[in-house]
């Protein structure tokens, strides 16, 4: 029905009010529900209304606004502190103590986060995004700096249908179309061999407690596992001679252990360094990611932070010790 300048939608009636013509819905059943477009964000509940915008949102704290789009910091919440002497004593000993695995305690001084004390350092969201890893999409955390809300905004629940088969045939130079999907790791790029690589800037440098020969033997599974967490593909970097950059890692004993060693005589043979694991240099190849997703890592900084976030959650399937992102071509250092 015509309402002067205002065009009313199907099923609505025009009502002339003191503040001018308004559309009104006499029976919400006959009108388009404003809730159909799910306007209420951050878990707010939507209630149909008879007047524009034909819905009202009941917001869950700390959100407000007509669509629960505004974050309001609770007024009297003091900044969280890590008060416990227990955590001060246990930080940076190489062991993750769950009681200290919090943002306020720097994730047990980095012990729970692959030595990265603040994976969300570049996240400028008003939300504390580390507290919003909750199997729900929180758009305010859905940015690369905030680690894509742990990929909770893009059907994180999708699992690889033929997981065992796809794991066995990952990166075997044969394209298996049933495995050529994001959740199956795009078959390790076996179906994209004819496409140009799309490398993220930088290098992921990971220390893992597996000797080089064991890691190389298990490389396909290792790359698939990390690629699944990062929703992209990884490969081991090659040096200028074309050799895979996987080197023995001799470990860094905790400060307490170093002190203990200095206060007693070395035993015969103790000087010989023992291989504790591997230092592996990885590159991110986004050639498939960019075709299927807008959640790809342009550089390795946020990818390293996301792996640290998984360490915090205890969802890593390999014994990673540390992860760093190197921007320049790395020297071969131990």
């Amino acid at each position: 029905s015509s309402c002067g300048q205002v065009k009313c939608r199907k099923g609505e009636q025009c009502v002339h009010t003191a503040s001018g013509p308004r559309c009104f819905c006499p029976s919400p059943r006959d009108c388009e529900s404003g809730c159909a477009s799910s306007p209420c964000q951050h878990g707010g509940s939507c209630h149909p209304q008879r007047q524009p915008p034909y819905y009202s949102c009941q917001c869950a704290p700390p959100f407000s606004g007509s669509r629960c789009e505004l974050y309001t910091a609770p007024p009297s919440t003091p900044p969280a502190t890590c008060l416990s002497q227990y955590c001060a004593d246990k930080a940076r000993d190489g062991v993750c103590d769950e009681a200290c695995n919090s943002h306020a305690c720097q994730w047990d001084g980095g012990d729970c986060s692959l030595t990265m004390e603040n994976p969300w350092a570049n996240c400028s969201s008003p939300l504390p995004c580390w507290d919003y890893i909750n199997n729900q999409c929180d758009e305010l955390c859905n940015t690369v700096e905030c680690l894509f809300d742990n990929f909770e905004c893009q059907g994180n629940s999708k699992t690889c249908k033929y997981d065992k088969y796809c794991a066995d045939h990952f990166k075997d130079n044969h394209c298996d179309q049933g495995c050529n999907s994001e959740e199956c790791g795009w078959d390790g790029l076996d179906c994209a061999a004819d496409q140009p690589e799309n490398l993220a800037e930088g290098t992921l440098v990971i220390v893992v407690l597996m000797p080089p020969e064991q890691l190389l033997q298990d490389a396909r599974s290792f790359l698939r596992a990390l690629g699944t967490l990062l929703h992209t593909n990884l490969r081991i970097k090659r040096d200028s001679q074309g050799e895979l950059m996987v080197y023995p890692y001799y470990g860094e004993k905790s400060a307490a252990m170093k002190k203990q060693r200095m206060t007693r005589r070395s035993l015969p043979g103790e000087q010989e360094q023992e291989v504790a694991g591997s230092k592996v240099f990885l590159e991110i190849d986004n050639r498939q990611c960019v075709q299927d997703s807008d959640h790809c890592f342009k550089n390795t900084d946020a990818a390293a932070a996301l792996l640290a976030s998984h360490a915090i959650q205890g969802t890593l399937s390999y014994p990673l010790v540390s992860v760093v992102s190197e921007s320049l071509t790395p020297e071969r250092t131990q």
Epitope: Y86, C112, L209, S254, P319
Partner: antibody, heavy 122, light 107 residues
Framework: EVQLVESGGGLVQPGGSLRLSCAAS????????MSWVRQAPGKGLEWVSY????????YYADSVKGRFTISADTSKNTAYLQMNSLRAEDTAVYYC???????????????WGQGTLVTVSS | DIQMTQSPSSLSASVGDRVTITCRAS??????LAWYQQKPGKAPKLLIY???SRASGVPSRFSGSGSGTDFTLTISSLQPEDFATYYC?????????FGQGTKVEIK
Amino acid sequence: EVQLVESGGGLVQPGGSLRLSCAASGYTFSSYGMSWVRQAPGKGLEWVSYIYPYSGATYYADSVKGRFTISADTSKNTAYLQMNSLRAEDTAVYYCARHSGYYRISSAMDVWGQGTLVTVSS
Amino acid sequence: DIQMTQSPSSLSASVGDRVTITCRASQSNRRFLAWYQQKPGKAPKLLIYGASSRASGVPSRFSGSGSGTDFTLTISSLQPEDFATYYCQQYYISPLTFGQGTKVEIK
């Protein structure tokens, strides 16, 4: 197959010392934390100590702090419990147990040894 | 230290019975709780971790629930091999602590 085998238990006088060994096989020893847990005759389980072999970090129950020392030799895939100033109340079966969560003390113990009996008596 | 209190300390039941054992913590350990089964002369065996996840090879008749301070182990239909002592354990913070045990005996 992941396996833990304890040895070194026996009879010792109060004030004496004993060193228990726990030989691990079937997994990367340095990657997982290891605890010693004891059980006095007819009693419940009591956690004694924890070590993460890779970093060498150690944790102790108050009842043994200053008397017991946990250590690990990654070249031998073996954890040790050096027990000094032993008391009658230390009499128990001592089990070594692997933690399931790599570097996390905050993880369950998923593999246990068969236990070794320590008797402290004059 | 977190004290763990199990109840009952012992119970008698028949094959096929549903058995419930509870464990209460003196302070919250979120879901960092495990249940172990021990038979006489044997080492403990991990049944449940993370309060409700079954360890590998553990039959589905064993289930765990709870979070915070109150936890439950349920055996839906008791089998002859289930007669044993059951322990809960928190692994949220050191020192790691166990409940005193619940002995499940044949009625």
